[in-house]
C-alpha cells in the first residue's frame, strides 16, 4: 500500500469518515503510519 | 478559517541562500505534514519536499537534496523552507501547502512567494 | 522519478463544452493521482483527489477518473470561470510529481 505523507493524510480522512470521528485524539497523520491502516 | 500565509518576495544573488516562511492559522499545525512545491516561470509545478512539523522528519525530491532544508518552528506554528547555493534556475515562486481534514478536508495552499535570483 | 504526461497541452473550448483532459502515468500509481486547477498569479486550487473524488465545495461538473497509468479530468460543461491550467498530480511514490498542465482557452 502506498505509504507517501499524501496517502496516509487521504486514508486516515477516509477512516474518520467511516467512523463518524470517533477515533483518539492523536490518531492525526504526523501521528499515523501506514502500518496502521 | 484555515490560512497559509507565507514571507514576501525576495531578490537574492547566485550563490546566496533563501528561506521562506509560511504561517499556519485555523488548525492544529502539528497533526498534518507540510508540503513545498516551486513554479519556475512558464514551467510545470515541482515538489521540493515535506516535513512532519510534530516529529520534524523529512522527505525531499532527490533534486533539491542538500541545498533544501525543511523546518519548523511549532510554537509559533510557522514551516520554513531555505534553499542554498541560489543559480539562476532557482527563480520561482515557491508554495507551502497541506491537506487538513479538520476543521475542513480540504488541500490549502499559501499565496505564494517570488523568489527571484539575479545577479 | 515518475513521469506524469498530459495531454493535449492547450486546448480551446467554449462555453458549455465538455472538455476532457488525459494524463498518463510512466507506471502504476494505483488510484493516487490529484488535479489541481491553477488561474495566472494565483496558488493552484486542487480539485480531485484519490483519482476521483471531488474535495468539498468543488463544482459537481468536475470529474475525475483513472486508475492504474491511464487518468481524466472532465468538464462536463465548461463555464467562464473554468478556463486556467489544469495539472495532475501523482503522490504514489516520491518524488510527487506533476503533469506539464493542460491551458484551457476560450475559443
Known amino acids: 500500500a502506498c505509504d507517501t505523507a499524501t496517502c496516509v493524510t487521504h486514508r486516515l480522512a477516509g477512516l474518520l469518515s467511516r467512523s463518524g470521528g470517533v477515533v483518539k485524539n492523536n490518531f492525526v497523520p504526523t501521528n499515523v503510519g501506514s502500518k496502521a491502516f | 478559517e484555515v490560512q497559509l500565509v507565507q514571507s514576501g518576495a525576495e531578490v537574492k544573488k547566485p550563490g546566496a541562500s533563501v528561506k521562506v516562511s509560511c504561517k499556519a492559522s485555523?488548525?492544529?499545525?502539528?497533526?498534518?505534514?507540510m508540503n513545498w512545491v516551486r513554479q519556475a516561470p512558464g514551467q510545470r509545478l515541482e515538489w521540493i519536499g515535506d516535513?512532519?512539523?510534530?516529529?520534524?522528519?523529512?522527505n525531499y525530491n532527490q533534486k533539491f537534496k542538500g541545498r533544501a532544508t525543511l523546518t519548523v518552528d511549532k510554537s509559533a506554528s510557522t514551516a520554513y523552507m531555505e534553499l542554498s547555493s541560489l543559480r539562476s534556475e532557482d527563480t520561482a515562486v515557491y508554495y507551502c501547502?497541506?491537506?487538513?481534514?479538520?476543521?475542513?478536508?480540504?488541500?490549502?495552499w499559501g499565496q505564494g512567494t517570488t523568489v527571484t535570483v539575479s545577479s | 522519478d515518475i513521469q506524469m504526461t498530459q495531454s493535449p497541452s492547450s486546448l480551446s473550448a467554449s462555453v458549455g463544452d465538455r472538455v476532457t483532459i488525459t494524463c498518463k502515468a510512466s507506471?502504476?500509481?494505483?488510484?493516487?493521482v490529484a488535479w489541481f486547477q491553477q488561474k495566472p498569479g494565483k496558488a493552484p486550487k486542487s480539485l480531485i483527489y484519490?483519482?476521483?473524488y471531488r474535495y468539498s465545495g468543488v463544482p459537481s461538473r468536475f470529474s475525475g477518473s483513472g486508475s492504474g497509468t491511464d487518468f481524466t479530468l472532465t468538464i462536463s460543461s465548461l463555464q467562464p470561470e473554468d478556463f486556467a491550467t489544469y495539472y495532475c498530480?501523482?503522490?504514489?511514490?516520491?518524488?510527487?510529481?506533476f503533469g506539464g498542465g493542460t491551458k484551457v482557452e476560450i475559443k
Open positions: 507506471q502504476n500509481v494505483d488510484t493516487n
Open positions: 485555523g488548525y492544529t499545525f502539528t497533526d498534518y505534514y
Open positions: 501547502a497541506s491537506i487538513i481534514i479538520v476543521p475542513n478536508y480540504f488541500d490549502y
Open positions: 516535513i512532519n512539523p510534530n516529529q520534524g522528519g523529512t
Open positions: 484519490s483519482a476521483s
Open positions: 498530480q501523482q503522490y504514489n511514490n516520491y518524488p510527487y510529481t
